[in-house]
Interface confidence: low
Amino acid sequence: RAPRCRELPAQKWWHTGALYRIGDLQAFQGHGAGNLAGLKGRLDYLSSLKVKGLVLGPIHKNQKDDVAQTDLLQIDPNFGSKEDFDSLLQSAKKKSIRVILDLTPNYRGENSWFSTQVDTVATKVKDALEFWLQAGVDGFQVRDIENLKDASSFLAEWQNITKGFSEDRLLIAGTNSSDLQQILSLLESNKDLLLTSSYLSDSGSTGEHTKSLVTQYLNATGNRWCSWSLSQARLLTSFLPAQLLRLYQLMLFTLPGTPVFSYGDEIGLDAAALPGQPMEAPVMLWDESSFPDIPGAVSANMTVKGQSEDPGSLLSLFRRLSDQRSKERSLLHGDFHAFSAGPGLFSYIRHWDQNERFLVVLNFGDVGLSAGLQASDLPASASLPAKADLLLSTQPGREEGSPLELERLKLEPHEGLLLRFPYAA
């Protein structure tokens, strides 16, 4: 008799793929544009990335550091009207893209939470949650919560409002903290909160360090669903050298949880390469004309257009990983087991019941390495086969689809491998 199938977990929409943050509409659209109507025209691009949700804004009225002139129920006219927002929501819904609205109050000011008037601001947020839920948004984000006094209790209250409206609504909180204890204390009183932080921001040094950070986090958070990013708002290039971008894309898409990216992460957008552009929100490079300030500063391979036409680009890798993440059960909600593979390497298995299984091996170092996969670290339910098929490598030149002997696995510098193998009873 065939073994009984394991019962599928309840999956919310944010469990099924990546979230894409557009914190600055003007920078995202460029060319002096930057409104909701223009963003609607970019939804097809978001669809091509296979992302499940768009984290938008803030777009509300906010006069820098002035509580009285901050209205979370009003859209800043520079971004458009309520009608434009409704139209964006409708179009996004048709394309199965959820819209999460950032309500960080004083986003133009010094302290995101107007440190002296916490209660006034908290009431404004509460009213705004109810208002925008009625308008049809799918969730909310609030950032810089380390600047919010009594953050845990406010988050619990806002979570109740959000979930009370529908279990299908999401609340995301962001913090600049990278301290695990602080992160855990925020999560403690908020069961379904998705928290973005700087926890992984200094993980780039070695495979062992990254492995330790990831496993500590997963062990500490237990069965709760988590998110993976390197910060609450900034680009991957703020933390990583170019040669590690592919490796991190592979890792973020294959860890158990929701990967969260900022606009431009998919093309390796780097403010440092664009003189005069702000680090936190450089202009999105749609094509070579997106940054006219310095002729020749932008080459085709830095842009969406150029990378779309190059199937070997970072953007193509992002699309491919996003596609795998959204359709493979083992990556959607599979178990996770990290195990030793040798110095400099981080490797893990994702598996769900009798579905196809995935092995990820990441070489964070700048030298080629032989992987010594220690299968003895793994439980019987997640044993390794002798061979696995190469689904993709972050480095070109490997014969994809071909079986690789796991005992003889060699990785190039900064190479990540995604291998698949069938369930064996």
Epitope: D310, G312, L317, G397, E400
Partner: antibody, heavy 123, light 112 residues
Framework: QVQLQESGGGLVKPGGSLKLSCAAS????????MYWVRQTPEKRLEWVAT????????YYPDNMKGRFTISRDNVRNNLYLQMSSLKSEDTAMYYC????????????????WGQGTLVTVSA | DIVMTQSPLSLPVSLGDQASISCRSS???????????LHWYLQKPGQSPKLLIY???NRFSGVPDRFSGSGSGTDFTLKISRVEAEDLGVYFC?????????FGGGTKLEIK
Amino acid sequence: QVQLQESGGGLVKPGGSLKLSCAASGFTFSDYYMYWVRQTPEKRLEWVATISDGGSYAYYPDNMKGRFTISRDNVRNNLYLQMSSLKSEDTAMYYCARDRAYYYGSSYGFAYWGQGTLVTVSA
Amino acid sequence: DIVMTQSPLSLPVSLGDQASISCRSSQSLLHSNGNTFLHWYLQKPGQSPKLLIYKVSNRFSGVPDRFSGSGSGTDFTLKISRVEAEDLGVYFCSQSTHVPYTFGGGTKLEIK
């Protein structure tokens, strides 16, 4: 072993249309990016079109965009090239080709070619 | 578009000789991911082209070790250490670093 067999070539008048087919066997067709490459009477080789493994993405040189459409049927293991507004300079032997590997479709060398099908555009 | 220039146009050789074909590109073929996508093909009379070398210097399966590729940036060379009768035909270099992919005009290897 990998086999690619083109068909559908022939004589066509300038401005006319033609649809080429390529039947693939001996490998998992849906796993690979596929290509059309042509060879002119002067024996010059020219890349014509690329299609992604699932068929969602197509790439063309600028002088063929809008006139040529590459498509595929992963159930029947067939690759197609629809050509319209044909010109005399489109006269060539048209080959379908498969890559050596399929890392995001970047060409690591066209490892497998069909025997070709001849397209002649002439009044 | 990247222009690929091959020389010589024709290369008469005696069997057993070494042959060398040059290929020059109008722009560097070093891709941003660190690879150089320069390939070599051989087309024998009445046949379709066959892949010999991929990514500058990697022999495709079944290609004899008398064929070797070298070069970087914009200058590349294909060498045949001891020419055999079955090596005769037209050799093409090709680049796929930049879209559109382009080919050289070909070098005809023939018996002296």
